[in-house]
């Protein structure tokens, strides 16, 4: 595998990769010389973060957000070398890519899930949402897939919109010239588009993890 | 302890509308997806309708389709259920449930009921 | 839709007996959506099993569940006099269906 950029800014860090980062370095001042097991490191630290509270995590989200506004300041002005066809710049302005309807149903589910077992990792909480949906009839799955259908409808429609109104210079710097077929060009959005929505679930993850304490 | 109370039941004529109200406490309500379930006289069971969580996705049976409009307010801890043209048919006990999973859906508390007679 | 039909519509038993009370379902049915529910007179239904075989939470251990094929059974080991109700099964694999309920009176 070839280095990637080295001009290419660097990604944005999560709330949870600051306070990581933190506890880090608080255990190389505290151990030195000391060897760290990653997989025991990772779950104190996990296990650490879940029993914070929205205070104590408000000073690793004030950092990502700043980080976050540092990365799309960067990505504005980054020009990617020639041939990297891979992460084109992303407008913000370009139509956000609708949810389907899994989505729409994790969503609705995800906040009782996390109340409940506080304790579950992520992957752990998507589990559980994949088997709700798998179990969930088809008739109840029906109107999320009536919502993701018309959210689908109308994002092609905005999507279309956008293409005709040309996308701006920032975004056109950022795009490789070679023509492409309207096919290939198609798939490649629809691949990113699927990274977002990964991305999305993600800080959907990150920001609700503060608000499980209703009860 | 899990509370569901029904409310708003009564005599109404044919034809006319009704709108049953179901308090839930003891629990946190916006978590759940909620259900109403009747009961006519002296019979079975029959599932009427389904809300999901924040109230964004619902369905009915059949049967009461584009009459009945089930809604809920999470910050009352509130469901609702508003009958309209009502037939003779409708007449049940009306439950409202709370709709849970642990490896399978089921309801898992019901209200006591409230009863609804639709006759002239 | 998914008929369920229970069999018998009622069951005399005595306290201290065994009672068995089947449900069938009219097609396939994911065994983890099936529920079995207790009813008395002027009551609401109450949960005891769900995904076919889970004792609901304080529901004692005479109460248990099974499944072959299409057909979901509750059995009761020995029946408690407080016992005596309608029992109705239901399932969530298209739209919520119950059985029509089998009636468990004293012999």
């Known amino acids: 595998m070839g280095k990637g950029d080295p001009k290419k800014p660097r990604g944005k860090m999560s709330s949870y990769a600051f306070f990581v980062q933190t506890c880090r370095e608080e255990h190389k001042k505290k151990h030195p010389d000391a060897s760290v097991n990653f997989s025991e490191f990772s779950k104190k630290c996990s296990e650490r973060w879940k029993t914070m509270s929205a205070k104590e995590k408000g000073k690793f989200e004030d950092m990502a957000k700043a980080d976050k506004a540092r990365y799309e300041r960067e990505m504005k002005t980054y020009i990617p070398p020639k041939g990297e066809t891979k992460k084109k710049f992303k407008d913000p302005n370009a139509p956000k890519r609708p949810p389907s309807a899994f989505f729409l149903f994790c969503s609705e589910y995800r906040p009782k899930i996390k109340g409940e077992h506080p304790g579950l990792s992520i992957g752990d909480v998507a589990k559980k949402l994949g088997e709700m949906w798998n179990n969930t009839a088809a008739d109840d799955k029906q109107p999320y897939e009536k919502k993701a259908a018309k959210l689908k409808e109308k994002y092609e429609k905005d999507i279309a919109a956008y293409r005709a109104k040309g996308k701006p210079d920032a975004a056109k710097k950022g795009v490789v010239k070679a023509e492409k077929s309207k096919k290939k060009k198609e798939e490649e959005e629809d691949e990113e588009d699927e990274e977002d929505e990964e991305e999305e679930e993600d800080e959907e993850d990150e920001d609700e993890e503060e608000d499980d304490d209703d009860e | 302890e899990v509370q569901l109370l029904e409310s708003g039941g009564g005599l109404v004529q044919p034809g006319g509308s009704l709108r049953l109200s179901c308090a839930a406490s003891g629990f946190t309500f916006s978590w759940y997806s909620m259900l109403w379930v009747r009961q006519a006289p002296g019979k079975g069971l029959e599932w009427v309708s389904y809300i999901s969580p924040s109230g964004g996705f619902t369905n009915y049976a059949d049967s009461v389709k584009g009459r009945f409009t089930i809604s809920r307010d999470n910050s009352k801890n509130t469901l609702y259920l508003q009958m309209n043209s009502l037939r003779a048919e409708d007449t049940a006990v009306y439950y409202c449930?709370?709709?849970?999973?642990?490896?399978?859906?089921?309801?898992?508390?019901w209200g006591q009921g409230t009863l609804v007679t639709v006759s002239s | 839709d998914i008929q369920m039909t229970q069999s018998p519509d009622t069951l005399s038993l005595s306290p201290g007996e065994r009672a068995t009370l089947s449900c069938r379902a009219s097609?396939?049915?994911?065994?983890?959506?099936l529920a079995w529910y207790q009813q008395k007179p002027g009551q609401a239904p109450r949960l005891l099993i769900y995904?076919?075989?889970t004792r609901a939470t304080g529901i004692p251990d005479r109460f248990s569940g099974s499944v072959s094929g299409t057909e979901f059974t509750l059995t009761i080991s020995s029946l408690q006099p407080d016992d005596f109700a309608t029992y109705y099964c239901?399932?969530?694999?298209?739209?919520?269906?119950f059985g029509q309920g089998t009636k468990l009176e004293i012999k």
């Open positions: 097609q396939s049915v994911n065994s983890r959506n």
């Open positions: 995904g076919a075989s």
């Open positions: 449930a709370r709709w849970d999973y642990n490896s399978g859906w089921y309801y898992d508390h």
């Open positions: 239901q399932q969530y694999n298209s739209y919520f269906t």
